[in-house]
């Protein structure tokens, strides 16, 4: 019954202090999307409900922005943001589709440049 597929941005990397867009796209199904949940491991980051719109979890309000579309923008990245992110599409009548993105947050280029000045 579940004919759809989730396409994601896959494994991505970004610099510490920067921002990144997490994107998923559901295709190959006629099912209707009623809600998309964004989660990091077991923590709920945000919800986009077809009727009620966006809700960002209070603990992430300062660093998470809704969109573009059903995607999610993470800002002011830290090394602790490295890890798995999941987009969970609730659809009728297919049920739940889940996509996975792995984000690696790298030390910024400023930190890398600093290494050049080390005494040999």
């Amino acid at each position: 019954m579940m004919t759809g597929t989730i396409e994601t941005t896959g494994n991505i990397s970004a610099e510490k202090g920067g921002s990144i867009i997490l994107q998923c796209h559901l295709s190959s199904t006629t099912a209707q999307v009623t809600q998309v949940n964004w989660e990091q491991q077991d923590q709920l980051l945000a919800i986009c409900n077809a009727d009620l719109g966006w809700h960002i979890s209070p603990s992430f309000k300062d660093r998470v922005a809704p969109g573009p579309g059903l995607g999610l923008t993470l800002q002011s990245l830290t090394v602790n943001d490295t890890g798995e992110y999941f987009c969970i599409y609730h659809t009728y009548p297919d049920g739940t589709y889940t996509g996975r993105i792995f984000l690696e947050v790298l030390e910024s280029s400023v930190a890398e440049h600093g290494a050049r000045f080390q005494i040999p």
Partner: antibody
Framework: EIQLVQSGSELKKPGASVKVSCKAS????????MNWVRQAPGQGLEWMGW????????TNAQGFTGRFVFSLDTSVSTAYLQISSLKAEDTAVYYC???????????????WGQGTMVTVSS | DIQLTQSPSFLSASVGDRVTITCRAS??????LAWYQQKPGKAPKLLIY???TLQSGVPSRFSGSGSGTEFTLTISSLQPEDFATYYC????????FGGGTKLEIK
Amino acid sequence: EIQLVQSGSELKKPGASVKVSCKASGYTFTSYPMNWVRQAPGQGLEWMGWINTNTGNPTNAQGFTGRFVFSLDTSVSTAYLQISSLKAEDTAVYYCARVGGYGGYDYAFDIWGQGTMVTVSS
Amino acid sequence: DIQLTQSPSFLSASVGDRVTITCRASQGISSYLAWYQQKPGKAPKLLIYAASTLQSGVPSRFSGSGSGTEFTLTISSLQPEDFATYYCQQLNSYPTFGGGTKLEIK
């Protein structure tokens, strides 16, 4: 108030067509899938199929293909069921029903129209 | 298609009685089950969804339980307005309804 209001009873001859309307109010029409359910006199409920109110894509249940067409007019928040080449066995009450719930286990038909009686008789 | 079998088909009971209606699925449907009440000449009304969650505005004497293939609807103390026909519905795949249970006054 959230409600679905259906068109009135119809008396049709075999071979004719009928179009039943279901007007939604009190909520965002395009955010909730719409279903159609048939109930023949003295019988149980039969799911006929549904229409994606966001894309307009219809899906018919087995046994309700060909003569049964689901459509929308989102500008007036209305879903339609058209039945062609009517037969005596199409005599039934037809209901539209909204799918409520955010997803997962929460899905259910939370709002129903009052029903439209379609009688097919020569 | 997933088949739902309701039992009993007919049930006679008195005001104040505790009644239980069973719904069995032909294959596992987890908790994707809803219960509806229908009175003559009226549209069905949602009572319970997700097998055990009471719909807003429905009296607490109604309760649902079960998971997998066997589910029950219980009315703890029948009221005069509860005499009606009850249907279960699965939403694990394309929806299907049980055959109904007609609850009559004894």
